[in-house]
Structure formats: C-alpha cells, structure tokens
Interface confidence: medium
C-alpha cells in the first residue's frame, strides 16, 4: 500500500503511518541492487491545542501552539514530523560501477512529532 | 510584529520566520519575572521538489518528496520544521513563590529544514 | 543463454539446517549480482539476500540465521539456512542480475524447502 494521507478536513492526531517505498517506483533500479525498497513510514497529521504527551512536542511547538490558538492567521500550527529515523543499508553501483554496500542515515521513521 | 506566516496559495520555500513571543499575551506574567518574552521564532513554507542543500532536509524526506510526486493524494510533502533549536533562561516562581532561575530547552528556532 | 540451476532444497526439522546452491551456466557477461528469493504457497515472492563482490545484503526475517556467499570461479552462490523455522518452509529461487542490466534478467527453476515443527 503507497500510504495512508487523510486529505479531509478533520484531520486526525500527529501519527506515523504505513508507506513502503519501492526503488523501481522511484526509477532507482539501475543504481540500486537490494533491496528492492523498503518500510519507510511517514509523519502525518494534526498537531492542535493541546499537545499530548505522546505527540513528543519540544517547547517551542508548545509555545508556538498557544500562539498560534492567538493568531491564526499569522503563525501556523506546529508541524508533524519524525522524531526519530533508522538506517538502512543499501548494495548499490558507484559511478565507476563497483557494487557497494551502505548504511543509508534517516531513511526510515521511528517516531513522530509535533515540532 | 507576531509573524508573518503565508496562507496564500503560492507559499514560499521552508524558512526561519520572525515571531516574538510576549509572555503577558499567554498569560504567563504571574508566574515569568523574566524575561518579558523572547525572539522564538517559527518554521514555514513549502517542501517541494526539489528540495535545495539549504532546506537541510533528511534522506526521509528526500525520499518522500518523491512518493509525493507519485502520490499525491496518498502522501504529504514534507513539512518544514526546526532542525535546531536553543534553550533560554527564565526566571520564575516555584508553587512554593521561590525564585527559580531555569534553562529551557528548545525554545528558540536557530534553523529550520525539510522533514 | 543463461541457464540457473538451484539445488539443495529438501524436508528438515525446525532448527535444522540446508544449504542451497545456485549454478549459473552459459554465455554470462559478468554477473553483478545473484539474489535469492522465496515463495510460500498462497503468498507474495519474498526477497531473502542479494550476494555481491560488494557484500551481501539480507532480509529481516532471515538476518543472522542465513549466509549468502559465492563461489566465481564456479559462477555459483551458495545460500546457508542454518536455525530454520516452520516459517522459512516456501520455493526458493535463485536469480542473477548481469553487468548493464538494471534488474534480474535470469531466474532458477527454484527448488523446494520444507521445515517440518
């Protein structure tokens, strides 16, 4: 399944959702041996008055919270994105065409946020 | 000046945008001796492809932008937030109306990226 | 023509082990990579490790039980399953991806292995 993105209104709470990402669909198969792709996750979701615990929200996303419940129109909600990301490694060409083996950094989403 | 954050439809790239916070405007002054407020800053504007060096944007994202474009319906663009943030001092009254000097932490956006 | 033999395969008791190989036979330019996958009856082809001069890669659900190595000098890759569960029990296939090519051009005829609990 491509991902689970709630475009109505009512959006719900700040969360991390499925998505798997194929290489082949992003074109990356010439460069990329294995894997074929991966569980990447995603941050999507509403970061409203008031944060919860669990929405791992840092200070300024509270702060920036109460201001924007003040003034909507000028200061935005705080905005949900990962909290924490994994590796992945990755057996790819270079470009002199010798296979390599890589630890790809924040490739995958562990947690989400409000920040 | 509260910010100035762009509801229009054409927004522009993820930026650091000014905003000072006025503790009395959240209704902190009973409880903040000082300071009166603070220069917090806010992230906003657009993640769109492709995303530049200076949008400090993870490999998560960069790979999302992608999917994005696939599936739009199905999966948000990244969202722009802080990708460092810095502490100040407050002094303040305890529950016991003791003077406490403290640090906070990440109240302050010193930058924001793609995430 | 590339011709992939895959051998090995057979009935062992859970926590036992097997040893697959994957022979690959004919006008071969090279090959880059051999990939082995697996399919459980009603379910979708899984990928099990890539073995590559570069290094070998593997999938979650056999990371440190399984060994992927290869042998050049008899264009043949080996695949040891040691700790195999009741869950690893599918068709696997071997398949070779050659210099240029930008996926597997090849596959095996895949050989069967059963974990019995």
């Known amino acids: 399944s491509v991902g689970d993105y709630n475009t109505s209104e009512q959006k719900q709470a700040c969360k991390k959702h499925e998505l798997y990402v194929s290489f082949r669909d992003l074109g990356w198969q010439d460069w990329i041996i294995a894997p074929e792709g991966y569980a990447a996750f995603y941050c999507d979701g509403e970061c409203s008055f008031p944060l919860n615990a669990h929405m791992n929200a840092t200070n300024h996303a509270i702060v920036q919270t109460l201001v924007h419940l003040m003034f909507p129109d000028h200061v935005p909600k705080p905005c949900c994105a990962p909290t924490k990301l994994n590796a992945i490694s990755v057996l790819y060409f270079d470009d002199s065409s010798n296979v390599i083996l890589k630890k790809y950094r924040n490739m995958v989403v562990r947690s989400c946020g409000c920040h | 000046s509260v910010g100035d954050y762009n509801t229009s439809e054409q927004k522009q790239a993820c930026k650091k945008h000014e905003l000072y916070v006025s503790f009395r405007d959240l209704g902190w002054q009973d409880w903040i001796i000082a300071p009166e407020g603070y220069a917090a800053f806010y992230c906003d504007g657009e993640c769109s492809f492709p995303l530049n060096a200076h949008m400090n944007a993870t490999n998560h994202a960069i790979v999302q932008t992608l999917v994005h474009l696939m599936f739009p319906d199905h999966v948000p663009k990244p969202c722009c937030a802080p990708t460092k943030l810095n502490a100040i001092s407050v002094l303040y009254f305890d529950d016991s109306s003791n003077v406490i000097l403290k640090k906070y932490r990440n109240m302050v956006v010193r930058s924001c990226g793609c995430h | 023509e590339v011709q992939l033999v895959e051998s090995g395969g057979g009935l062992v008791q859970a926590g036992g082990s097997l040893r697959l190989s994957c022979a690959a036979s004919g006008s071969i330019r090279g090959f880059v990579a051999m990939a082995w996958y697996r399919q459980a009856p009603g379910k979708q082809r899984e990928w099990v490790a890539t073995v590559t001069n570069g290094g070998t890669l593997y999938g979650d659900s056999v990371k440190g039980r399984f060994t992927g190595s290869r042998d050049n000098a008899k264009n043949t890759v080996y695949l040891q399953m040691n700790s195999l569960k009741p869950e690893d029990t599918a068709v696997y296939y071997c398949?070779?991806?050659?210099?240029?090519?930008?996926?597997?051009?090849?596959w095996g005829q895949g050989t069967q292995v059963t974990v019995s609990s």
């Open positions: 398949a070779l991806r050659q210099i240029g090519a930008s996926g597997y051009d090849y």
